[in-house]
């Protein structure tokens, strides 16, 4: 029961996490900036992984997509890649984990197969969560670096000159959504891996073999010789190749407490 609960909870937590990763990836508020040197109106800029937006106090809002691929910063491309990899792995993990759920019966799927699928999905969730956390952290680092550069390189310019606009770079809502979502996916993955341990049947490394004698008190000696006590018809030590040994697959036998450890 606890295993089913752990697996189910892991699935739900991962599902929420992956939904969050998708939401964060699509959001525009990865970076937000307030322009201070604007004497007209409060201008609020925010950027996402796919487009940049401007919002003014007058209510005007405009967004423009990054239509070029090659010209964009490598760091932005890396973040995009990490988030997409996280989403893809998470989606595959969800698909696998649905079939791995103990509460869902699909044909005659054994617990060992479900355990393997649970472990696979758990690992996928962990990697997915790590990808999201890494992506968001790389972007956050890029923002911090940009902020320090923009404040350090302030200089006024006239006559064809250029100056860095004094902006306050702040972490957008998407960063926090991404961090939390990545964390949830990671936790969900760990829970799935824990559930896997409970799902796996405790099997021995050897196949249980039951021995059946043709005579009354028959034992096996090393080397495959059958020793007779004299009560049976076989009074001589005769090598038996087709002896009474049968695996459980071949002969139906009554279970013994020694059959399973």
């Amino acid at each position: 029961m606890a295993v089913t609960a752990c697996q189910g909870l892991g699935f739900v937590v991962s599902l929420i996490g992956i939904a969050g990763i998708i939401a964060a990836t699509c959001m525009d508020q990865w970076s937000t900036q307030d322009l201070y040197n604007n004497p007209v109106t409060a201008v609020f800029n925010y950027q996402g992984l796919w487009r940049s937006c401007v919002r003014e106090s007058s209510g005007f809002t405009e967004c423009r997509g990054y239509f070029t691929l090659l010209g964009l910063p490598a760091m932005l491309q890396a973040v995009r890649a990490l988030m997409i990899v996280g989403i893809v792995l998470g989606a595959i993990g969800l698909l696998v984990s649905i079939f791995a759920l103990k509460c869902i019966r699909i044909g005659s799927m054994e617990d060992s197969a479900k355990a393997n699928m649970t472990l696979t999905s758990g690992i996928m969730f962990i990697v997915s969560g790590l990808c999201a956390i890494a992506g968001v952290s790389v972007f956050a680092n890029m923002l911090v670096t940009n902020f320090w550069m923009s404040t350090a390189n302030m200089y006024t310019g006239m006559g064809g000159m250029v100056q860095t606009v004094q902006t306050r770079y702040t972490f957008g809502a998407a960063l926090f959504v991404g961090w939390v979502a990545g964390g949830l996916t990671l936790i969900g993955g760990v829970m799935m891996c824990i559930a896997c341990r409970g799902l796996a049947p405790e099997e021995t490394n050897y196949k249980a073999v039951s021995y059946h004698a043709s005579g009354h008190s028959v034992a096996y000696k090393p080397g495959g010789f059958k020793a007779s006590t004299g009560f049976g018809s076989n009074t001589k030590n005769k090598k038996i190749y087709d002896g009474g040994a049968r695996t459980e697959d071949e002969v139906q036998s009554y279970p013994s407490k020694h059959d399973y450890v």
Epitope: S31, Q33, L35, N37, N38, V40, T41, V43, N45, Q47, S52, V54, E56, S57, S58, G59, F60, T61, E62, R64, Y66, T68, G71, L72, P73, L76, M142, L143, N146, M149, S150, G157, V162, Q163, T164, V165, T167, Y169
Partner: nanobody, 122 residues
Framework: QVQLVESGGGLVQPGGSLRLSCAAS????????MGWYRQAPGKGLELVAV???????NYADSVKGRFTISRDNSKNTLYLQMNSLRAEDTAVYYC????????????????WGQGTLVTVSS
């Protein structure tokens, strides 16, 4: 390389009109606030008028009612229509734009033009 090129300046009589233009070119991603500043001989830099992407405007008190700022976002061009010009409007007019580049849309820069001279004299 981003460039802001002003044009339309020249000699005009008091009460006359001029239309200044400023064209921004280069690998620009988005231009945010654009504005006109002027520097009269022997004086400091003075704000004339500014306009946001959403067409919110602000004018210096000395030009209100006489000057009109406008922009064409699709062409990355800024205009200043100057009417009822006075002798005190004589100055070098600079174009200014807050913009970000296609290569780094996360960083904003202020670019300045070389300036165009407007002389109001009879």
């Amino acid at each position: 390389q981003v460039q802001l090129v002003e044009s339309g300046g020249g000699l005009v009589q008091p009460g006359g009109s001029l239309r200044l233009s400023c064209a921004a070119s280069g690998s620009i991603f988005m231009i945010n606030v654009m504005g006109w500043y002027r520097q009269a001989p022997g004086k400091g830099l003075e704000l004339v008028a500014v306009i946001t992407r959403g067409a919110s405007t602000n004018y210096a008190d000395s030009v209100k009612g006489r000057f009109t700022i406008s922009r064409d976002n699709s062409k990355n061009t800024l205009y200043l229509q100057m009417n009822s010009l006075r002798a005190e409007d004589t100055a070098v007019y600079y174009c200014n734009a807050d913009l970000n580049l296609a290569s780094d849309p996360f960083k904003w820069y202020t670019y300045w033009g070389q300036g165009t001279l407007v002389t109001v004299s009879s």
